[in-house]
């Protein structure tokens, strides 16, 4: 059956060394757990993380997200899953793609993540 | 298994404030956006704002512009509502409700509602 | 704002009835649309999302369908616990908004 893939229509924002969500949904919902789920950098398709068969790839990953990430599957099956990042880091600024893949149909969408330096803060003062 | 818990009943009078609290539990409070909807006695539903408690920013229904402001603590994974300048007319359940992670998504969790009755 | 009327207001009907509630949009709101049980005291409950999508934990025989302006909420066969008031809601623009209410009471 077809779906649409949807996400969040704003950045995600998250500060460095904190952790950072990104939801992705598809509609109508529908059971996902026998799909393939994933996200990749949208510049060069790094895979950030996959799952597939019902297991986390985590071979498949990019060097740079091993280890740092999550899949919370706990809503799989309504077609509801987050990518937790944890540790972000500056390089993970930019944009994001989930994909869900049913046999060989396949849905994506496009989200943000924004990443901020807790301790940076400019005295406009000082800006001449 | 998430859960909002809010404060209790409130009476009050015309022309002062009230300030209701949903405390969140069960969910990475910060990523989901927090809506208040109001129900007067007999009415139907009617959604008064929303916020995303990660940018902290607060949308609001015109018709509450300038009287209702939301917030939320992330500290305390606690949003509140205060509407001020109260009326007989804003004698009503109030609820606050969770959409999943963003805005324009339905209201999945609810919290048990506060009884707001404005009376001189 | 997209203003939801449902029809009926009241609706009266008999445990095991086939029971049929429509929500209709001022404008097209794609698929776009929950409903939501509520009894008396508690707070509102959601059956179905995206038009069509039951939520996890509610019975098979609640059911949606529609799209852009005309929606349906459809109790194939009524049971006891589904006498309550039954609200749709558009969420296809930043001010969600409310259908009336349908009250769906024993015959």
């Known amino acids: 059956g077809q779906f649409r893939v949807i996400g969040p229509g704003y950045p995600i924002r998250a500060l460095v060394g904190d952790e950072a969500e990104l939801p992705c949904r598809i509609s109508p919902g529908k059971n996902a757990t026998g799909m393939e789920v994933g996200w990749y950098r949208s510049p060069f398709s790094r895979v950030v993380h996959l799952y597939r068969n019902g297991k986390d790839q985590d071979a498949e990953q990019a060097p740079e997200y091993r280890g740092r990430t999550e899949l919370l599957k706990e809503t799989i099956s309504e077609g509801k899953v987050t990518l937790r990042i944890q540790n972000v880091r500056f390089s993970d600024e930019g944009g994001y793609t989930c994909f869900f893949r049913d046999h060989s149909y396949q849905e994506e969408a496009a989200m943000e993540l924004k990443v901020e330096d807790p301790f940076y803060w400019v005295n406009p003062g000082v800006l001449t | 298994q998430v859960q909002l818990v809010q404060s209790g009943a409130e009476v009050k009078k015309p022309g002062s404030s009230v300030k209701v609290s949903c405390k969140a539990s069960g969910g990475t409070f910060s990523s989901y956006a927090i809506s208040w909807v109001r129900q007067a006695p007999g009415q139907g539903l009617e959604w008064m704002g929303g916020i995303i408690p990660i940018f902290g920013t607060a949308n609001y229904a015109q018709k509450f512009q300038g009287r209702v402001t939301i917030t939320a603590d992330k500290s305390t994974s606690t949003a509140y509502m205060e509407l001020s300048s109260l009326r007989s007319e804003d004698t009503a359940v109030y609820y606050c409700a969770r959409e999943w992670y963003w805005p324009d998504n339905p209201f999945d969790y609810w919290g048990q509602g506060t009884t707001v009755t404005v009376s001189s | 704002d997209i203003q939801m009327t449902q029809s009926p207001s009241t609706l009266s009907a008999s445990v095991g009835d086939r029971v049929t509630i429509t929500c209709r949009a001022s404008?097209?709101?794609?698929?776009?649309l929950a409903w939501y049980q509520q009894k008396p005291g508690k707070a509102p409950k959601l059956l179905i999302y995206d038009a069509s999508s039951l939520e996890s934990g509610v019975p098979s025989r609640f059911s949606g369908s529609g799209s852009g302006t005309e929606f349906t909420l459809t109790i194939s066969s009524l049971q006891p616990d589904d006498f309550a008031t039954y609200y749709c809601?558009?969420?296809?623009?930043?001010?969600?908004?409310f259908g009336q209410g349908t009250k769906v009471e024993i015959k």
């Open positions: 404008q097209s709101i794609s698929s776009w």
């Open positions: 809601q558009q969420y296809h623009e930043y001010s969600p908004t």
